[in-house]
Every structure is written in C-alpha cells, then in structure tokens.
C-alpha cells in the first residue's frame, strides 16, 4: 500500500549503485502481517545485509518474504562477479550516509550522530533508542570516518567490506549499527526496568522476559532504557510477539493494527520478529 511504500528508503550494499526499483522490496521491513499462523519464511535484512529467517503470520505482509533462503538470496543479494570493491581512495560514501536523521519510534532519547548531506558534516541528534536507520553513529569520530570526506574529497577512512561466505553479501565492517534486535524479539525487551535519573513518578510498563509479561514500573522522567512503554498494550505489541507462542487450533486470527507514522513520541508502529 502507499503508506508502506512511503515508509521505506532504499538502502543498498556499500559499494553498489542503488538497487533498481524492482528490488526495492529488499529494503522493506520484515512484516509478519496481522494473522497468527507460524510460518517459517525468509527476508533480506538491510542492516546485516543477509537473508534471514522470520515468522510470518500467514496473511498480508509485504514482498520482502521468500519461501526459501535461496530465493531470497537470488532476489536480494548480488553475485560476486557484479561487485566492484573499490580501493580506499576511490570509495564513495555508503548509501546510508544520505538518509535523513531518523529518531525511530521509541523514547529512550540518547545522543547520536548523523551525516548531514547538506552541510557535508556529521551532526548531533537525539535517537529514541530503537529502529531508525543506519545514518546513526555512537560517536562523532565514527560518523566522520564513514561518511565525511577527507581533505582531498575522498573518504577519511576505509569503509571496509567483507564478502560474507554464507550468503555472498557485502557486510560493512567499520560501522557499529545500533544492535536493535537479538533472539526472536527486540533486544531491549530483555533489559531490566530502569527508573532513570530524574525525580518524577510516571506510570510506565516494561517487558519482564523472565516471566514473559509486561509489568508496571515507576519511571523518573529521564534517562533509563528502551524497555519503557506508556501502556501495557504498547509493551505487549513490541515485546510479546518476539517470543513465539503456541496458538489455539482454528483458522487465522486477524488483529487490528494501529499504524501511526513518523511521530516519534507515540510508539504504535508494529515491532516485528527479528530484524527490521
């Protein structure tokens, strides 16, 4: 749908020209769809640049979904022969350097840096702690090394690439992409509740991965971590689905999905199993 199309920016292998439009679905997030089946499928993960497994609910979703690992690789990874790995002095910036700064949908705001393609400089912004894009660096130096030009108009540092033997995809070596997900659910769902640094007593919910439930806690109003939700429903939506559960017998169950685009403060966007 149009909302889906609007939401995704094409991000491609570091050393390759942008993907042709026919392959833009490779940049889509893994979308399990609103149904409740448990079907093993594969999607291309733009962050790890690999085809990975995810659980598909059985209806809707998007085109970044393949029956087999081979089919995914065929559609979304490039042949070694088509790759031109340039030397340091010839390198162009990775495509993600040109993406707009993206705070993501969470609200555990932390300082990060992005490359501003207008000013040609790395600049500070506030990242919400989850999702977002790869134009997001923990340090100013890291951002400069990867995205800024050196004095001769060349890259400051070698944006190293390594051919991944498993799936023939290029894996960037220099950048620390925020580790957004681990296991079957978002990694922040595994962190303990963190009150933070201030003195307020706001009612929030966190996901308790030991008992597998969302529990209330008092948030101080600043600091803390991303395992912090304004409602139990939001907490469950983000964390519960990542931990695969058995479903009752019967047909596919459709659930209504709220999609609130782009507003950082309201985290209603669906968080999917595995990487986005």
């Amino acid at each position: 749908d149009s909302e889906e199309d609007e939401e995704h920016t094409i991000i491609t292998d570091t050393e390759l020209p942008p993907l042709k439009l026919m392959h833009s679905f490779c940049a889509f997030k893994a979308d399990d769809g609103p149904c409740k089946a448990i079907m093993k499928r594969f999607f291309f993960n733009i962050f790890t640049r690999q085809c990975e497994e995810f659980i598909y609910g059985g209806c809707e979703g998007n085109q970044n979904r393949f029956e087999s690992l081979e089919e995914c690789k065929k559609m979304c990874t490039r042949d070694n022969a088509n790759r031109i790995i340039k030397t340091t002095l010839q390198q162009e910036k990775p495509d993600f350097c040109f993406l707009e700064e993206d705070p993501g949908i969470c609200r555990g705001y932390i300082t990060r840096y992005f490359y501003n393609n207008q000013t040609k400089q790395c600049e500070r912004f506030k990242y919400g702690g989850c999702l977002g894009n790869m134009n997001n660096f923990e340090t100013l130096e890291e951002c400069k090394n990867i995205c800024e030009d050196g004095p001769n108009g060349f890259q400051v540092d070698n944006y190293g690439t390594q051919l991944n033997a498993v799936n023939n995809s290029l894996t960037p070596q220099s950048t620390k992409v925020p580790s957004l997900f681990e296991f079957h659910g978002p990694s922040w769902c595994l962190t303990p509740a963190d009150r933070g640094l201030c003195r307020a007593n706001e009612n929030r919910f966190y996901y308790n991965s030991v008992i597998g439930k969302c529990r209330p806690f008092k948030y101080s109003g600043c600091g803390g971590n991303e395992n912090n939700f304004t409602s139990k429903q939001e907490c469950l939506r983000a964390c519960k689905k990542g931990f695969i559960q058995r479903i009752s017998k019967g047909g596919l169950i459709k659930t209504k999905r709220k999609r609130k685009k782009q507003r950082v403060k309201i985290a209603y966007e669906e968080i999917f199993v595995k990487n986005m």
Epitope: E100, T111, N116, T119, E123
Partner: antibody, heavy 118, light 112 residues
C-alpha cells in the same frame, strides 16, 4: 543574515485550530532541524517540538503531543505548526528556532502571539 | 524531565558592576559524548530570545566578552564582568543534553 519570521497567530476559541508559519531566510533551510518554542504571558520558555532536516520525523513535548503537528516545506523555506484542540493554557508567544549541528537552538524568530479564549 | 533551577530570579545591579547568575540542573548535564549541553539565552524587553552561550562556555558570535559561562555537571554560572545598560533583560539557562529540552525560570537583570 539569518532571519526567522513567524506569522498566523491570533485569537481562537478553546477547541479551535490555528496554523502558524515561520518563513526562513539567510541560510540553507533544508540543512537544519527546526523547533517551535512557546512563552506564556509573563512566564518562562517551553519547548514545543522539533522537526528533522527533511521533515520526515518529529519530536513533541508531552503537553502538545497528539494535538500539534509540525511540518515543513523545504522548497518554500517554511516551517509550520498546526495546532488543534486548543486550550487556554496554549496561550503564548510561539517562536520558531533553528537547530545547529550540536542539536541546540541558535537563532530565534520574533514570535507570534496565540490567544486561546472564549 | 530535567529540572533547571535559576537563582536569583531578580538581580538589581549597578552599571559597571559585575553580575552573576546561578543555574542548577537535576540530574547532571554531562552527555555520553563527554560534552555538556548547557546554554544561556538573553531576552531583552519586548524582544525574542537570543543565544549568548552554548556548551557551557562558548560565546556566540557578536556576544561581548564581558559575558562568561562556566560550570560542570549540575552547577553552572553566567557572569557579566561589567554590566551595561543594554544588558537589561531576562536570562535563561537551558539544557540540550536530555530530551525534552528544558529551561530555567529566568533571571531578570535590572539596573538599580
């Protein structure tokens, strides 16, 4: 010279709507994140929200979240604040402010007064 | 949200004499990148705010060097070495370390 000029303020009834504009000149508008900050009569300053350089993403203060929407038109060097479901406590002078590379506000406009009263 | 507390709220000063404004934050404004995003604004009567100082002590261009900012962690100070008539107005400290941005209540500087 950096210039930010707000407009669109006025008197509005509680529950009503208003759209503020901020015309930017003297710098490359699309290079900067932008903010709205307000100041109630005789009171201090309160940050309202921020919009990213390309306009795709916004941050909001809890007090206005869900009621106010910030947008921008980089082709027109303009920043906007759509205010819905206005309340008496939204009465303030609204300033637009530019965000520098440190994610700090550096230049401010002259402000436009919004009065919410029945 | 981070609380910014300014003292005094009113500061009557004699022309040519020094002035000092204190700003305290809770919690610390030292960010993960090692920088402290504490800033000072000046708002002259009937005018919009103007940035004076950012990152604790860096003066904005065009700001006279009689203004100095200092401090670290949670305690910050704005000093005017010799107050001039054009310095009358309200001074705000504000922080850009933690989100959302928060401001002090303001200190009104007036001539005795």
């Amino acid at each position: 010279e950096v210039q930010l000029v707000e407009s669109g303020g006025g008197l509005v009834k509680p529950g009503g709507s208003l759209r503020l504009s901020c015309a930017a000149s003297g710098f490359t508008f699309s290079s900067y994140a932008m903010n709205w900050v307000r100041q109630a009569p005789g009171k201090g300053l309160e940050w309202v929200g921020t919009i990213t350089t390309g306009g795709s993403y916004t941050y909001y203060a809890d007090s206005v979240d869900g009621r106010f929407t910030i947008s921008r038109d980089n082709a027109k060097n303009s920043l906007y604040l759509q205010m819905n479901s206005l309340r008496a406590e939204d009465t303030a002078v609204y300033y637009c402010a530019r965000q520098d590379g440190n994610f700090l506000m550096d230049y401010w406009g002259q402000g436009t007064l919004v009065t919410v009263s029945s | 949200d981070v609380v910014m507390t300014q003292t005094p709220l009113s500061l009557p000063v004699t022309l040519g004499q020094p002035a000092s404004i204190s700003c305290k934050s809770s919690p610390s404004l030292l960010d993960v990148d090692g920088k402290t995003y504490l800033n000072w604004l000046q708002q002259r009567p009937g005018q919009s705010p103007k940035r004076l100082i950012y990152l604790v002590s860096k003066l904005d261009s065009g700001v006279p060097d009689r203004f100095t900012g200092s401090g670290s962690g949670t305690d910050f100070t704005l000093k005017i070495s010799r107050v001039e008539a054009e310095d009358v107005g309200v001074y705000y400290c504000w922080q850009g370390t933690h989100f959302p941005f928060t401001f002090g209540q303001g200190t009104k500087v007036e001539i005795k």
